[in-house]
């Protein structure tokens, strides 16, 4: 799925909101520092595609995400904000629901999310370029222009 | 606990560069936008700019975009700050300050500033 | 870029006073319902400290009389009962679009 047109202040606002406090509840417990982050994103089409990946995919030692609280409500807010993006998930929630497996909160998982709350922060802060500027690559947001 | 070390004071020469440092421990460096602000004597704050460790990208305020650069040394998780060109107007504490955890686009650490004075 | 001013310039009140700070931007700092305003407090020597995040959320270990209103372009900081160690500078900051600016402060100051 193209991320390119959806309504990244709505998902920004969604997740500011409530995702931020779901993801907070699931990593509690958990130090900051405690993993090292590996996965970034460079602009908010591909932020949104990392999260999506992390937040649905199951991985090796984490299957179950999915069912989280804050992968709902992202799930339910890409499908609010990004037209189209329901219609592409389908099949991926059908495959999704075969592969289910009882939850379990595993290090690999807290790891993952931890990797997700970067993402995010990402997302919602890209530094932006700014008019007269040049020094920034990535240009994404041209359509919003209140992108803080 | 999520803690930002500034360099010490630095007397210059006008014309002069001064390179102020900030090294960040206990958070994950490189996923947080960090800032510079600047503070002249008995005035209020002012933004310089701010990088995103990850990649090195950076967002200048206008005024200080042709003097002042941004850097970091993700090795050594390590913010730095130069500006050029040295005027007395340039006498400021100068902070470095990270970004919240959420993007809400507050700053929740500080460091606890460098004065930099700007002298003949 | 946005300008925000903050009013009065200095405010003397006593210990015990209600304080309201005001903060007034030139255009709107909300977007998609949220308003990206946030409040810090400075004291001599030391670097400012967050008071309160968009608009009304208190800072971690922020006391509870401290509180903050207002949307779109008109902002209140208000603390209930002031107490010694509140007297000091204030500053809005607005991040919604940037640059990022800071208003000129308000200096609470013991009457």
């Known amino acids: 799925y193209d991320f390119t047109n959806c309504d990244f202040e709505k998902i920004k606002a969604a997740y500011l909101s409530t995702i931020s406090k779901d993801l907070i509840t699931y990593m509690s417990g958990t130090k900051s520092t405690e993993f090292n982050n590996t996965v970034s994103c460079s602009n908010r089409p591909h932020c949104l595609t990392e999260i999506q990946s992390l937040t649905f995919n199951p991985t090796a030692g984490c299957a179950s995400l999915a069912k989280e609280m804050f992968a709902m409500k992202t799930k339910a807010a890409l499908a609010i904000w990004c037209p189209g993006y329901s219609e592409t998930q389908i099949n991926a929630t059908q495959a999704m629901k075969k592969a289910r497996k009882s939850k379990v909160t595993t290090n690999k998982c807290l790891e993952q999310v931890s990797q997700l709350q970067g993402l995010w922060r990402r997302f919602n802060r890209p530094l932006l370029k700014q008019q007269g500027s040049s020094d920034y690559k990535d240009d994404d947001d041209k359509h919003h222009h209140h992108h803080h | 606990e999520a803690q930002l070390v500034q360099s010490g004071a630095e007397v210059k020469k006008p014309g002069s560069s001064v390179k102020v440092s900030c090294k960040a421990s206990?958070?994950?460096?490189?996923?947080?936008?960090m800032h510079w602000v600047r503070q002249a004597p008995g005035q209020g704050l002012e933004w310089i700019g701010a990088i995103y460790p990850g990649n090195g990208e950076t967002s200048y305020n206008q005024k200080f975009k042709d003097r002042a650069t941004l850097t970091v040394d993700k090795s050594t998780r390590t913010a730095y700050m130069e500006l050029s060109s040295l005027r007395s107007e340039d006498t400021a504490v100068y902070y470095c300050a990270r970004e919240d955890d959420y993007g809400e686009g507050y700053f929740d650490v500080w460091g606890q500033g460098t004065t930099v004075t700007v002298s003949s | 870029e946005i300008v925000l001013t903050q009013s009065p310039a200095t405010l003397s009140l006593s210990p015990g006073e209600r304080a309201t700070l005001s903060c007034r931007a030139s255009e709107s700092v909300d977007n998609s319902g949220l308003s990206f305003m946030h409040w810090y407090q400075q004291k001599p020597g030391q670097p400012p400290r967050l008071l309160l995040y968009?608009?009304?959320n208190l800072g971690s270990g922020i006391p509870a009389r401290f509180s903050g209103s207002g949307s779109g372009t008109d902002f209140t900081l208000t603390i209930s009962s002031l107490e010694p160690e509140d007297f000091a500078v204030y500053y809005c900051q607005q991040i919604n679009t940037d640059p990022l600016t800071f208003g000129q402060g308000t200096k609470l100051e013991i009457k």
């Open positions: 968009r608009a009304s």
């Open positions: 206990g958070f994950t460096f490189s996923t947080y936008n």
